[in-house]
Structures are given as structure tokens and as C-alpha cells.
Amino acid sequence: SSSPTSSASSFSSSAPFLASAVSAQPPLPDQCPALCECSEAARTVKCVNRNLTEVPTDLPAYVRNLFLTGNQLAVLPAGAFARRPPLAELAALNLSGSRLDEVRAGAFEHLPSLRQLDLSHNPLADLSPFAFSGSNASVSAPSPLVELILNHIVPPEDERQNRSFEGMVVAALLAGRALQGLRRLELASNHFLYLPRDVLAQLPSLRHLDLSNNSLVSLTYVSFRNLTHLESLHLEDNALKVLHNGTLAELQGLPHIRVFLDNNPWVCDCHMADMVTWLKETEVVQGKDRLTCAYPEKMRNRVLLELNSADLDCDPILPPSLQTS
């Protein structure tokens, strides 16, 4: 097992018998769980691609960075990381790609220093509303989380429960107002059709929000007004057709913002006029010269910045008596 003098790059592997032998006792200071690699110097434990079916019980108390990626965890129960003594130093926890489909209330309790959590690439069909808050109180103790990475956590369509996936995720983000200190939230690649209107208002500390590669059609009911610290907003690869005046004004009013809008199917008709005007004036959109029309057919691949009001027309709607069948 690793010694305090080992270098940051040297990882020790445990003997396989250790985990079961001492799992009921507090871990020895320098012990490493079976199937894991540990570096006390780097305060890091890696249990990667080992088909673990449970979180190891005998994690060393020094662990600051814990990688539990590429496993078969399936379920994170309440207190999955609760230990005696507690894992007081654990700051970064990566559980990506570990086939988690259920995260229960209080799964991350008793981790007082946890700042970064990555649950990406897990089909989270059952994410408890109290997964991050740990309590069903209307106002919970503040979570120490600063970064929450939830990219590609949507289960395949035939494996989803009969409820709104967006609603389930947002309930977990908002429960008990525990995530008021969250600065980075990544929700890319989740097939989101909409963003519930209250979610951003209750995450006032956000600096970075990634909603790329979803299926968002509109931001009409989403308010960015409270996000005065927001620095980056990723909306690439969605289904956005146009941004309306209210949204444009709110984005323009954010002092540090950079917005990414590439690869959306912009509809270049009369409703696009305000957005085109805004794009020509604003500095907040990164790569704005790459934005092109997708519809109508006659406008396809036209660059938004090169359009003028004469290009942006809407076909008149004929009164019923003049329509042909």
C-alpha cells in the first residue's frame, strides 16, 4: 500500500483480500481498496473500469479526488459515501459511465468538502429530488457543490419512467435550495425539450451553464435576469428557431456573458428581424458569423449577419375564402 513518501504519480494497488477483511472497521491510514489504485501524495483514489457493483467501504480518509468511473454501480443509496471517520477531504467525485440508474435521497451526505460531482453518462431514470440536498426540508443545509456535471444522463427512450425527465432533474437541482452556491452546471446531451422556467432563477451563483446538444425549441419562458454572474451559456446543437426580444434584452444585460448558438435550425422569416439586428450589434455571441438559416428552404445556409429586413418576410396568411384545398 502507498506510503506518505510516494510520489504523486505513483499509485499503489491493494491486495484483493484487504477490502473484505477490514470493511467493517475504520480504514487504516494508508490502505487502498481492492481493485483500486491510490496515491496518498496526490490524495487520489482511482477505481476505474473494474466492474465494481458497490462503492468501496474502505476508502482512505485522505482521499480528495475519487474516480469511480466505468463500473456497474446501478444504485447509489443514501449515505453511499458516509464513513467513520467521514471523508472530510473529498472534493472531487467522478462517477461517470458507471451504469447508475438510481440515485437516492442523501446519496452524497456526509461529504462536507464535495465541490465537484460528475454523474455523466449514467442512465438516471430515478434521480431522487433529494439526491443533492439530502433532506426533504423546504430549505436544506447548503450543499458545498460548486460544479455539477450531468451530461448525457437521460436513459434510452424505452427505459424512461412515465414522467418528465426535465422535471425530475430540475426537482433535484432545486430541492431545499441547497445548490445556491453552484457555479457550473452541465446538462448537455439530455434530449431536453424545454427548460422549466423556475430553474435558473434559483441558481443565482451560476457562472457556466451548458445546455448544448439538447432539443430546446424555445427560450421564451426562460429568464436569465437573475444570473448576473453568468459567464458562458452553451446552447449549441439544439432546435432553436429564433430568440425573441425579451431573451435578447436579458442576455445583453448580463455583464460577463458569452453565448454559444452554433448549429441551431434558425428560421429566417419576419420573426427573425429583431435577432438579426441584435446579432449585428452585440459582442456576447461567440462565433456569430457562423450562424446560418435552416428555414425556409430559399434561405437555407444564408449567414444571419448578412441578412437585412427585406430578406426576412413572412408569407401572408390568406383568408379562408381565398385558400385552395
Epitope: N51, T53, Q72, L73, A74, V75, S98, R99, L100, D101, E102, N122, P123, A125, D126, P155, E159, Q161
Partner: nanobody, 122 residues
Amino acid sequence: EVQLVESGGGEVQPGGSLRLSCAASRRPFSSKTMAWFRQAPGKEREFVAAVRWIGGATRYTESVKGRFTISRDNAKNTVYLQMSSLRAEDTAVYYCAAGQAWGTKFTDYSDWGQGTLVTVKP
């Protein structure tokens, strides 16, 4: 309550292979885990393998790792146990079970099939 029906058992020589199937009468949404247990004559029922309907996480008892593979077909509401390199000690009645937990205990599972006999002998 979901009905579980096992099939695919039989007699096979050591080193041979069999594939067991467990068909659920409907997708047991309340049961998140499907498992195979086995019971040899005069012994207790023991956990063999489990799979999650959603996500497909798998787990195995140590003695079958690398020899048995559990899988599921959500469209058919069916779970499979592919058994290879069979040994005499694998002889048992194999039971399919459905439950909520991600566990290896008999009590983690609420719904059970009737079992299918696997016999390994020269």
C-alpha cells in the same frame, strides 16, 4: 404480480454451454433488477448473477465470473443467462427472480419463477 417463466435447462457435458431464458409476463416496472439464483440438491439457494432493466448494470458471484453472462432484452421482457465452461458443481435448479434492490440476498427479490434444472455430467 409479475409471472416469471424459465426455460433452456437440460443436461450437458462438462465444458459445455447452455442458455437459460426468463420471460416476464409484463415489464415489471416496480422491479428494477432481474437475477438468477440456483439451488443444488441439499444446499441453500445461492445468488448467481443480476442485471438492471435500466442501464444494464450486471453483477456476478465470484465462481461464475468469466464463464456466465447475464443480459436482458427490454423489448421482449426477457432475461438470459449464457453459461459456458460448465462444471459439475454448476448442477442445480436455476431460478429467475425480480426485485427492487441491487442485491445478492434471497430477500432482495420478491417475485420468483418455478425454476429450470441444469445438469452437468460426463
